[in-house]
Amino acid sequence: DIIMRPSCAPGWFYHKSNCYGYFRKLRNWSDAELECQSYGNGAHLASILSLKEASTIAEYISGYQRSQPIWIGLHDPQKRQQWQWIDGAMYLYRSWSGKSMGGNKHCAEMSSNNNFLTWSSNECNKRQHFLCKYRP
């Protein structure tokens, strides 16, 4: 049997059963999540669940830019340092940059400081690029 790889929406890229869209425009975290959802297919701000997934995403983004942080789907909705993925994925893989926590910073971004492989927390109303993900 021939197994066809699922296709992603135009402009999205495929990796290990998921489609990713890197949006190089400015949104706060909640507006970014709304835009992701608007694409249907269960799309959300991206969960990053392994180093392999993180590395693939980082390599893709580095082809566009290397200086701007990017919203991902990790947030702290209760503001109690109880982080969770907006798509419901298990919060097992962690890649915090170390000096991330504290203040009114309850949304996570991929940090450009380590080639997008580590995360930092930031104020959710900050407007920046974002990454969406869905399973086709």
């Epitope: 869209g21 890197y22 425009k25 949104r27 507006d31 709304l34 835009e35 608007s38 701007q68 407007r127």
Partner: antibody, heavy 119, light 111 residues
Framework: EVQLLESGGGLVQPGGSLRLSCAAS????????MSWVRQAPGKGLEWVSA????????YYADSVKGRFTISRDNSKNTLYLQMNSLRTEDTAVYYC????????????WGQGTMVTVSS | FMLTQPHSVSESPGKTVTISCTGS????????VQWFQQRPGSAPTTVIY?????PSGVPDRFSGSIDSSSNSASLTISGLKTEDEADYYC???????????FGGGTKVTVL
């Protein structure tokens, strides 16, 4: 052919209201964020408002916030701008513009509709 | 956040003109810059998007660049033609307040 066609402009008194429409054709309207941009006579371009493809998120310039409302009807492929409490400084040609999904870059513009606010 | 352009530039046919667009704060390289051409009585059209990309149909005489050291973007038109006579606007994004920001426009005159 990808096209945007504005309508609804005209002469209105200060304090009055007007609703502009922008009819889109030739593309999947709901997949694109849209903006209104205006240009006062002899002046430069000024961004007014934007709306996401789904209509779930809206954005406004400070100069129109609380007076203008942007909306869209994806079933009719139409973008709207409801303008209330109009002022003389709102006199301008109003353009609708399509934005690229991944970058917000304007790629298609309508031909514009003239709004004149005068007593 | 503001984008400042020269009010006007003029040059002879066949020559090269460069229009600058300087950001008032932050780093202009942080967000994409677009350039629009507007001929009298017409709607704007895009000549450069994403800093240096040309839409199909725009001649390669038009080019865009970013200079982080001067916090400015530039539009260069080489081999100037009479049909290039128009107003040119730069546009970018404000990550703190406004959603979209336009420069004040530059009138290009072909002598």
């Amino acid at each position: 052919e990808v096209q945007l066609l504005e309508s609804g402009g005209g002469l209105v008194q200060p304090g009055g209201s007007l609703r502009l429409s922008c009819a889109a054709s030739g593309f999947t309207f709901s997949s694109y964020a849209m903006s209104w941009v205006r240009q006062a006579p002899g002046k430069g371009l000024e961004w007014v408002s934007a709306i996401s493809g789904s209509g779930g998120s809206t954005y406004y310039a400070d100069s129109v916030k609380g007076r203008f409302t942007i909306s869209r009807d994806n079933s009719k492929n139409t973008l709207y701008l409801q303008m209330n409490s109009l002022r003389t400084e709102d006199t301008a040609v109003y353009y609708c513009a399509r934005q690229q999904p991944f970058t917000d870059a304007f790629d298609i513009w309508g031909q514009g509709t003239m709004v004149t606010v005068s007593s | 956040f503001m984008l400042t352009q020269p009010h006007s530039v003029s040059e002879s046919p066949g020559k090269t003109v460069t229009i600058s667009c300087t950001g008032s704060s932050g780093n202009i390289a942080n967000n994409y810059v677009q350039w629009f051409q507007q001929r009298p009585g017409s709607a704007p059209t895009t000549v450069i998007y994403e800093d240096n990309q040309r839409p199909s149909g725009v001649p390669d005489r038009f080019s865009g660049s970013i200079d982080s050291s001067s916090n400015s973007a530039s539009l260069t038109i080489s081999g100037l033609k009479t049909e290039d006579e128009a107003d040119y606007y730069c546009q970018s994004y404000d990550s703190s307040n406004l959603y979209v920001v336009f420069g004040g426009g530059t009138k290009v005159t072909v002598l």
